[in-house]
Each structure stands twice: as structure tokens, then as C-alpha cells.
Amino acid sequence: EAHKSEIAHRFNDLGEGHFKGLVLITLSQHLQKSPFEEHVKLVNEVTDFAKACVADESAQNCGKAIATLFGDKVCAIPSLRETYGELADCCAKEDPDRVECFLQHKDDNPNLPPFERPEPEALCTAFKENNDRFIGHYLYEVSRRHPYFYAPELLYYAEKYKNALTECCEAADKAACLTPKLDAIKEKALVSSAQQRLKCASLQKFGERAFKAWSVARLSQKFPKAEFAEISTIVTSLTKVTKECCHGDLLECADDRQELAKYMCEHQDSISSKLKECCVKPTLQKAHCILEIQRDELPTELPDLAVDFVEDKEVCKNFAEAKDVFLGTFLYEYSRRHPEYSIGMLLRIAKGYEAKLEKCCAEADPHACYAKVFDELQPLIDEPKKLVQQNCELFDKLGEYGFQNALAVRYTQKAPQVSTPTLVEYARKLGSVGTKCCSLPETERLSCTENYLALILNRLCILHEKTPVSERVTKCCTESLVNRRPCFSALHVDETYVPKPFHADSFTFHADICTLPEKEKQVKKQMALVELVKHKPKASEEQMKTVMGDFAAFLKKCCDADNKEACFTEDGPKLVAKCQATLA
């Protein structure tokens, strides 16, 4: 139904607290450099305006689209050009072009300091002084660093954050109470941010069909007892919600998400028995619970897919008449039967099936052509299974740090043009997948690994698009969303790369490394390792092992020495010469 005033409608649906939070997130995600106080001022103005529209929907400007109201607010900021430069040029455009222009100026890698957590005492003092302001500050700091964070989920994390502080600030040992709780929130929020970023990239770069296919596979795995029609209904709503959030229409997104949660709870009998525990929770927790829901048990009786998708005489007719519905049904049927496969695998299987039908249905004897289609799809299952097995074996053998080093070498060889800090960051992220997934049971390892890799590679692709340096990376990132991971896996040493000249500075260390926290020490060593590979991309594994061993011995010796700096100054050049000789 159409509302006279969209903003009044959303204010009424969401309530003042959530409304203000979402307005703050919207502003912080678009204006990532502005100080908190400036945003608070704008939030209050927008909220007062919304309240006026609730009182009188016919009041001036109340009938305007929310995006237009936000755009007008942003464009009225006097310091816009000096703070944001060419973002101010968007203000010369008319909506919807202005909205698109703002979106293009969102920065996935803003030059902001890391979000440091104050000491528990300081945290609690600030929280007790004004907890609304404190939580607002949390929303602001997270949103400006993660401009695509799923806004209604961020409200959920803010609520969790608030609950943790409420409980722990009364505890005798505040740090012991707070640290594990806040660490858990941070880790989950970072994964949530990456998941939403992949959804937005999927929609923006590969279109609605790609996102819908992803959603069909995921929901079919989670709700294997639901009918395809039910899955399709949810996917349609979910696509609308995700599009709205990715587009910056956060009030609409949060409201429609609430509606979707309500719909799912009203229809839980035909969706999943697991929804029961979610549906008794309050709004934010309910939607979060549904998002994270454990998958339902498989129906006891499911027929073989060959019956409908190979042997049925109407396969080509069904494929020709309603291609997307037919393939959607195939993806649904396959996914609900295979909860242990990753989304990427399922989509590649569906793509393989589609390609086979495209070819065979044009032939004289289609059935003879596609009769063995399922056996022909086997490599799509074998490849990731084998890869996960090999990498988990390597992880078990080397441990997380050693595994990261192996990945640093591997990825530097694949894309040596990428900057050293970026290669180290991704090697570390990829290495942590081993920790997350390799200890899981066999049936969960595969999906855990590939689903996480998809998130990490998506971030790599987003940052690489901003400053492209490698044609191979561009190719893997843009050709196909579902084939990104296999594409990166298939890359080997870049034969076109001209090795970097040797710079002793890259391998020069000082006594300060000895006092660094372990993680920073590792990063420094991994930077040197990547530089080494850029200098000698075809060095053998044995040579690399020797160099790394010498390097570790040198660090140990000098960090144990009485005069550390003298040791580094004296032995450093010797080490560099020895390494050059090893790699010659």
C-alpha cells in the first residue's frame, strides 16, 4: 500500500530507537570522514523532521522519497566539498542518479585508524555516563569502516554490545567478563560484514539472477523440508531487502526485513521446525536468529534427481519453456539434498547442468547426449574435495603460522604485482580458514572452507578493482562469481612477471622487532618472505625452507643477544648475502 509520507511510515514501523540508529548508520556509511558530533546533529534533525511528518503526513517535504531527503541533507552540508572532494559533484545530479553517485563514493578501505578498544574501566565509565551516546558511537565507528554492513544486523550487534557492558560493568573483574564477550561480538560482526559485502557485490557486479541463485542454494540447504514455491517466495523478499540495504535504503531494508521475519514465522510449519525458537524472540534477535538458523533435518524420503532431470521425456521442453524455473528447481532439489556442499559448488553444478542442456537440447538425440550428465559433473565435486583435503593436511602439518607462510609464497607467485602488505594480509586471512574449518567434521569442512574463501576473495577483488595491478586477478574476479575460487586455485607462477630487483632494505631488521607482539612479529617476517618471492618467484620449496630457517635462527640469535642492535647491524648483511647465495 502507498503511504503519503514514506518517512513517517518507516518511523512508525521501526520505532524511534531503531529509526535513529539506522539514520546514523546511513550517514556514517556515506560520510565516512565526518566527526561523530556532526552526524548526531544530522540524526536529530532527521528524527525531528520524521516526527513532524508523523504528526502531519501532508506537511512540507513529507511526501518526498527517503533517499531524496537524505540526499538533500547531505548536499546541504557546508563543508562537503572540502571534506569529500568530488563526492560534492553528486549534488549537481537529479535522483536517482544522485543516489548512484553517492554509492560510488563509498570507500571500502577508508584511511581510518583501527577501531581500538579502550581499557575496560574507561569503557565502563563512558558507557555509564551516557549509554545511548556510547552505543551511537559504536554504530558510527563500525559503519564508517564497513560502509556495506547489513544495517539491521549492526543494530543487533550494538544491542549485544550494550548487554555485555550492562552486565560486565557491574562485575568485580570487568576485563575478565568483557574481553571474551567483546572478542566474540567483534569476530562475528566482521564475518557478518564480509557476508553482506559479498551479497552486495553479487547484486551489483553480477546481477539479480546471480544473487537469487545464491539464495536458492543457501535457503534450500537450510530448509530442505520447504517446497520450492515457498523457497522462491522467501528469495524474492530477501532479494528486495538485500537490494535496499546494498543501495543504502536502510530504513526500508530494516522494515522489509522485519516483515520477512514475520512472514517466515507465520508460515513456519511449511518452512522449518527450527524456526520455533527464533519466532518467540523480539524483533532484532528474531531476524538474527533466522539468519543464523541451524539447518533442518532432511526429509526421510527424497527421490533420485535422475527421474526428473535426466529420464523425464520432457526435460528439454521444460528447459525451453521456463528455463529459470526449471534450473531453479534443479538447484533447489540438489541443494536440499547436499547440505555439506559449499554454495559455490552447488552453483557450479547447476551451471554445468545448464550448459549440458543448452548443448544437448539442440541435438538430434538429446537424451543420449545428457544421459550421463551427473557423472560428468563429478570433477566439480572432486576438485574442491581434494583441495580441502590437501590444504587441511598441510595446515595440520605446519600449524597456522607455517600454513600462512605457504600461502604467502603461493599467492605471491600467482599475483606478484599485488602490494606486499596486501599479499600478507590475504595470506593471513586465508591461513586462518585452516584454523576455522580444518578441525570440523568431514561433512562440514568443505562448505566451511569454500564459503569463507568466497568472502576473502571478494574483499581482495573489491580492493583490487579500486587499484588494479594484475590482469590475472582482474580476470578471476570479474569473469564469474561462482568460478572465482577455482580460478584463483588454478593460477600458478606468473610467467610474465619480471622479478623485482634485490633491495637489502626489505630484509633489514632492527632490535625493535624483538619487543613486538607475536602477531606483528609474524607480519614483519611474512613481509620479508613475500619480498623474497617477488625477487625469486621460481625459488624451490627447499631453497625457501633454507632461507626461512636461516632467517629464524638470525632473529633468535639477535633477540637473545645482550647488545641486540649491534647483532642486527653486524649479522644482518651476512644473512642477506647468505640468502642471496642460497637463491642464486
Partner: nanobody
């Protein structure tokens, strides 16, 4: 440890019958779809028949339709293959297999395999 043990194979005249059994242990039998595969000398392993977890759905290769029947007894943790009107081309080693997740009955979906039992059909 999961074990699938086939029995009932042997030498039979063309046109005769055999009943193969596969006893499963070490797994929750009712959570697994079961299948029979066969491999003739010098040929690739092929699927013969499979049955869903509750026994409500079966799938037969064209070459055995109307002659072979699969059934299961979840109380006894056993799956059976009744083979009638046997032909010389049915000669092969027959393998029993179990699949936790099953969509297409392809070989790669099966998690556990038996050692096989030899069926020889003489003309």
C-alpha cells in the same frame, strides 16, 4: 568403524536368480541411502540400483529394470538385491554402498563401500 559386508554372490545359470545381502554396522543405517554398483572385468563401475533412506524411493538402471528389486530392512540394518532372469552380461563384482547425502546416486556421492561379492552368470 563403518563396515558394509556383502554376501549371496556365486555361480548361476542364465535365467536363474540370486539374492544379495549387505549388512551394515557402525553407522545410523536409517540415515543413509543405499545403493548397489557393479564392475564387470575390464569395465568401469556402474550404478545398478539405489534406495532412499526409508525405502519409499528406488532407482534402477535401464539394464536391470523389471528383473532386479532392491529392498531394505532398517531394523536389521540390511539392504537386499533380488536378481531374477539373470543374463551373462550381469556377470560382475557387486558392491554395496551407503550415502549420507544423496541426490543423483552417482558414485561420488557414496561415503562407504563394501568389498564386493562376485556374481557369475554362465550361459
Amino acid at each position: 568403524e563403518v563396515q558394509l559386508v556383502e554376501s549371496g554372490g556365486g555361480l548361476v545359470q542364465a535365467g536363474g536368480s540370486l539374492r544379495l545381502s549387505c549388512a551394515a554396522s557402525g553407522l545410523t543405517f536409517s540415515s543413509y541411502a543405499m545403493g548397489w554398483f557393479r564392475q564387470a572385468p575390464g569395465k568401469e563401475r556402474e550404478r545398478v540400483v539405489s534406495i532412499s533412506r526409508g525405502g519409499g524411493y528406488t532407482y534402477y538402471a535401464d539394464s536391470v529394470k523389471g528383473r532386479f528389486t532392491i529392498s531394505r530392512d532398517n531394523a536389521e540394518n540390511t539392504v537386499y538385491l533380488q536378481m531374477n532372469s539373470l543374463k551373462p552380461e550381469d556377470t560382475a563384482v557387486y558392491y554395496c554402498a551407503a550415502a549420507r547425502y544423496w541426490a543423483t546416486g552417482s558414485e561420488y556421492e557414496f561415503d562407504y563401500w563394501g568389498q564386493g561379492t562376485l556374481v557369475t552368470v554362465s550361459s
